[in-house]
């Protein structure tokens, strides 16, 4: 099939003592092969500070798949989600507050 | 076909920079990371640093201060320079496509390396 | 940086032999563990990524086993091109590092 982007969106869970999960999740792309991963001022996280899900079908013929990542609370301008897909790329910051979410499709 | 292939100088003088060219084919630079690595005569290897695909760069923090990775997608082309060289420099030097799919990061696939020999 | 150590730095077998190269980090690193091979050419080859998973073209004679801080790779049936050296690599911790490397020869 044909290449489909990302439609990448970044979220924060609720503070627990003074830490804050980043969510950085990836939906409705095609081929499957995709990169994800948190960097803080520019520089990438070490596998180890990161975990991931699967990259599983989400029954449209596409794929979807997270990387999430724990920070302290007021640092989140400090972090970006890259992500890459089929010779694309993106960066996505940490929304401010958590009540809000960004959500980009890419072209 | 997935090709890199590394062109140096050979020879640098004590204190002087390298600056050495990773050619690549077969993939676009603008989705995949490339790594530079080393490998000092009988000895094993030591990554240097990696250049994104988005042109954001990671590096070794022992040679952070000496190092800088930079590319032009449209040439296909990454670049080493290294500042202050050393005889203990003296290496191959292979460039490497890295595959980063979530749990999984590898470099897959490998330029026959380029040897430099820092010498007065 | 995580220290990566190869106890056996050469060793020497038959034609058909089941060769186990050992690999062990100075910390856990999550099974986050590649295998290559380096030709006496220098001609560098990946083997096995994340402690278990053969690349495609890799023969299946070559196998990763291992968990926390201790990794193996297995060569089921030693085969004249297998002579080399061969380099475990973690990447659980930036800088990814490697072990000192391990040369088979044939006896």
């Known amino acids: 099939g044909s290449t489909v982007p990302p439609m990448v969106n970044v979220t924060c869970s609720e503070v627990s003592e003074g830490n804050i999960t980043v969510t950085c999740r990836a939906s409705s792309f095609y081929p499957r092969n995709i990169t994800l991963t948190w960097r803080q001022d520019g520089v990438s996280l070490s596998h180890n500070t990161q975990q991931w899900g699967d990259v599983l079908p989400d029954g449209n013929g596409t794929y979807q798949t997270w990387v999430a990542t724990r920070i302290r609370q007021g640092e989140e301008q400090r972090f970006t989600c890259y992500m890459e897909h089929s010779g694309n790329h993106g960066t996505h910051p940490v929304p401010s507050g958590n009540s809000h979410h960004h959500h980009h499709h890419h072209h | 076909q997935v090709q890199l292939k590394e062109s140096g100088p050979g020879l640098v003088a004590p204190s002087q920079s390298l600056s050495i060219t990773c050619t690549v084919s077969g993939f676009a630079l603008t989705g995949s990371g490339v790594n530079w690595v080393r490998q000092p005569p009988g000895k094993g290897l030591e990554w240097l640093g990696m250049i994104w695909g988005d042109g954001n760069t990671d590096y070794n923090s022992a040679l952070k201060s000496r190092l800088s990775i930079s590319k032009d997608n449209s040439k296909s082309q990454i670049f080493l320079k290294m500042n202050s060289l050393q005889t203990d420099d003296t290496a191959r030097y292979y460039c490497a496509r890295g595959a980063h799919y979530g749990k999984r990061w590898y470099f897959d696939v490998w330029g026959a390396g380029t040897t430099v020999t820092v010498s007065s | 940086d995580i220290q990566m150590t190869q106890t056996t730095s050469s060793l020497s077998a038959s034609l058909g032999d089941r060769v186990t190269i050992s690999c062990s980090a100075s910390?856990?690193?999550?099974?986050?563990l590649n295998w290559y091979q380096q030709k006496p050419d220098g001609t560098v080859k990946l083997l096995i990524y994340?402690?278990?998973s053969l690349p495609s073209g890799v023969p299946s004679r070559f196998s990763g086993s291992g968990s926390g801080t201790d990794y193996s790779l297995t060569i089921s049936n030693l085969e004249p091109e297998d002579i080399a050296t061969y380099y475990c690599q973690q990447y659980s911790k930036l800088p990814p590092t490697f072990g000192g490397g391990t040369k088979v020869e044939i006896k």
């Open positions: 910390q856990g690193i999550n099974n986050y």
């Open positions: 994340y402690t278990s």
